[in-house]
Interface confidence: low
């Protein structure tokens, strides 16, 4: 059928990997607080997945606020190189393979894989779409490669680690992790799926910006929002190409100070999720 054909249309943009944060406060919105000072601070932006500048009012706010770009990166972005090197050299499972499955605080219900230390195999679980822990893989193969034992009791493949000829160090090679991203598509592509208020059950697609994919959902027939497409391809056309890699890896995206005062002491769950 035509939708089957559409399925194989080439979308060249890199898919976003799962969002895995070190601390839950990294998912909070930038909160300038109720005071009127103009102080340059940094916060971790869950949409662009990087630390960015914002203007802090000087009081209250939340924990997603750092004095320097370096401090923000240290707290909210993962550098797993040391752990990867250690596990590769010692042929051990990474520590996170032994963590319990963690759905996180959001409500996307994405099928993911985790290593179950009881059964010694990778299994599916429901991931909410944000936070959680690193025992969380997009594909079964990735989970098996990292956490399951190979036939000889060793890991099958530890992140594709290879020797870097420049500094003779081990470097993790990953095709999945993008560099810096900006979203230039329609703003509604960043909103959650919204069933609306009626009682129908229509098959629709919405763009899940956490995982960078279009997923099906049930639309009630009225209301809702614009992140609502009748086909997967229409969804991809509208939203997928919005994620583009930044040309320059330097510089910061500035967040304008809000004119109208809004209390935004809310976690990612409220940003991204609507009770339906």
């Amino acid at each position: 059928d035509s939708e089957e054909d559409e399925e194989h249309t080439i979308i060249t943009d890199t898919e976003l990997p799962p969002l895995k944060l070190m601390h839950s406060f990294c998912a909070f919105k930038a909160d300038d607080g109720p005071c009127k000072a103009i102080m340059k601070r940094f916060f971790f932006n869950i949409f662009t997945r990087q630390c960015e500048e914002f203007i802090y009012g000087g009081c209250e706010g939340n924990q997603n606020r750092f004095e320097s770009l370096e401090e923000c990166k240290k707290m909210c972005t993962r550098d797993n190189a040391n752990r990867i090197i250690k596990t590769t050299l010692q042929q051990e499972k990474p520590d996170f393979c032994f963590l319990e499955e963690d759905p996180g605080i959001c409500r996307g219900y994405i099928t993911r894989y985790f290593y179950n230390n009881q059964t010694k195999q990778c299994e599916r679980f429901k991931y909410g779409g944000c936070l959680g822990n690193m025992n969380n893989f997009e594909t079964l193969e990735e989970c098996k490669n990292i956490c399951e034992d190979g036939p000889n009791g060793f890991q099958v493949d530890n992140y594709g680690t290879q020797l870097n000829a420049v500094n003779n160090s081990l470097t993790p090679q990953s095709t999945k992790v993008p560099s810096l991203f900006e979203f230039h598509g329609p703003s509604w592509c960043l909103t959650p799926a919204d069933r609306g208020l009626c009682r129908a059950n229509e098959n629709r697609f919405y763009y899940n910006s956490v995982i960078g994919k279009c997923r099906p959902f049930k639309y009630s027939g009225c209301g809702g929002n614009e992140n609502n497409f009748t086909s997967k391809q229409e969804c991809l056309r509208a939203c997928k190409k919005g994620f583009i890699q930044r040309i320059s890896k330097g510089g910061l995206i500035k967040t304008k100070r809000k004119r109208k005062k809004q209390r935004v002491k809310i976690a990612y769950e409220e940003i991204f999720v609507k009770n339906m």
Partner: antibody, heavy 122, light 111 residues
Amino acid sequence: EVQLQQSGTVLARPGASVKMSCKASGYSFTTYWIHWVKQRPGQGLEWIGAIDPGNSDATYSQKFKDKAKLTAVTSASTAFMELNSLTNDDSAVYYCSREVYYGYDGDYFDYWGQGTTLTVSS
Amino acid sequence: DIVLTQSPASLAVSLGQRATISCRASESVSVHGTHLMHWYQQKPGQPPKLLIYAASKLESGVPARFSGSGSETDFTLNIHPVEEEDAATYFCQQSIGDPWTFGGGTKLEIK
């Protein structure tokens, strides 16, 4: 109209292997997972495993991981389940079903095949 | 594995009366307000048919006399008023994680 059409009744000898099919139509085959469920006569339903036809990722119940092998051929919109080393305990009706993922509502089986009856007998 | 225990195993209900079927999970199947418990109806010689998903949501085309409720570990399927065509076996099923599991089934007879 969404349909899952399963292959017909199979009679097999103990120790043999069988492969049954589930042909999907009326929707994009690669978008939805296909699950397999076993039902022995007069008994309940047992989940065997599931396959994502889009990339052939398969996941199995611990109980069936050495018994069943799930595959899919996207060009034919067909999922397959192969059962090996058959015993009398494998005699059952086997259903394929489509898993629907609807965001906030979780996921579940919205369409089922009519079932393939397997009888293992010497 | 999550074990789903259905009760009763069978029940006979008079036409027009209420049928109540219970399903208890060995651990919670709810995450952040979504209840990953679903109900199916199966008639002899037929595959199961989805009735209720996410504990309480009625599948399209299913009569409104079917309703579901519950959260965490305790779920209920209600049929009211019961009709002749409702004679069948009813199964609950959870999808919070692999392996997906089903309840043992409840056979409903109409008196």
